[in-house]
Interface confidence: low
């Protein structure tokens, strides 16, 4: 394991895993940025997705200092999205195409949170908003939202990766 | 001006298959959506499906749900309507039609798109 007993992550294995994360959350839909995606009730459904913050140690002193923080807030947002991914949410209708690569950002945010997960220890998960559009077209939208924070989340994470792959591996 | 040319039209037996392609011409497309439709004489054109562009995300209609695939090559710039099983009722001119991004909603109205194709004759015979 990347984290056994709570001592430090393999930062270049997570910092490979967490760039190729962001390739793959791009190509699952590189034209979100440039959607207008405002809608009734758009609030409550990206509030509650996770967010790294100021307070969660992944500035460049908070790794320094003691990395669990921000790791252990990294690996509750890897299971969050893991989760959506796996939901009604992607796997209803619309179908995805065979060839998207929503089924591989799936696997890797699965795999990048195994990395982090501590032997023996169990980190505290953030539960998933109980989202369960009926119509297809409120199911697009909601893909959109969640991709769309999605690659701001992974964005960070790769940063913070990267800087301990620099700075703090062994 | 964007003009969608389609092709592979025909007559096929019942159960038979067909593939129809759409490929927009006239300038680079970066439209939000394809959609096939399909109309008979005398009848509103009815939505059969469509793809969002950019992820690649399909729905169709009832009627077609299980036996039409729509797919795009974004390299060829070309999308396509794969009908297997078909059935007499299947019998239809097919229209593609796009739609540019202004949105992220779901278009499945003749309204929703920006453009049209003038349409392949399909014939499925018993």
């Known amino acids: 394991r990347a984290v056994p007993g709570g001592s430090s992550p393999a930062w270049t294995q997570c910092q490979q895993l967490s760039q190729k994360l962001c390739t793959l959350a791009w190509s699952a839909h590189p034209l979100v940025g440039h959607m207008d995606l405002r809608e009734e009730g758009d609030e409550e459904t990206t509030n509650d997705v996770p967010h790294i913050q100021c307070g969660d140690g992944c500035d460049p002193q908070g790794l320094r200092d003691n990395s669990q923080f921000c790791l252990q807030r990294i690996h509750q947002g890897l299971i969050f999205y893991e989760k959506l991914l796996g939901s009604d949410i992607f796997t209803g209708e619309p179908s995805l195409l065979p060839d998207s690569p929503v089924g591989q950002l799936h696997a890797s945010l699965l795999g990048l949170s195994q990395l982090l997960q501590p032997e023996g220890h169990h980190w505290e998960t953030q539960q998933i908003p109980s989202l369960s559009p009926s119509q297809p077209w409120q199911r697009l939208l909601l893909r959109f939202k969640i991709l769309r924070s999605l690659q701001a989340f992974v964005a960070v994470a790769a940063r913070v990766f990267a800087h301990g792959a620099a700075t703090l591996s062994p | 001006e964007v003009q969608l040319v389609e092709s592979g039209g025909g007559l096929a037996q019942a159960g038979g298959s067909l593939r129809l392609s759409c490929a927009p011409s006239?300038?680079?497309?970066?439209?939000?959506?394809m959609g096939w439709f399909r109309q008979v004489p005398g009848k509103e054109r009815e939505f059969v499906g469509v793809?969002?562009?950019?992820?690649?995300?399909?729905y169709y209609a009832d009627s077609v749900k299980g036996r039409f695939t729509i797919s795009r090559d974004s390299a060829k710039n070309t999308v396509y309507l794969q009908m297997d099983s078909l059935k007499p009722e299947d019998t239809a001119v097919y229209y593609c039609?796009?739609?540019?991004?202004?949105?992220?909603?779901?278009?499945?109205?003749?309204?929703?798109?920006?453009?049209w194709g003038q349409g392949t004759q399909v014939t499925v015979s018993s």
């Open positions: 793809i969002i562009w950019t992820g690649g995300y399909t």
């Open positions: 006239g300038r680079a497309f970066s439209g939000s959506a």
């Open positions: 039609a796009a739609r540019t991004p202004n949105s992220s909603w779901f278009p499945t109205t003749l309204y929703e798109y920006d453009y």
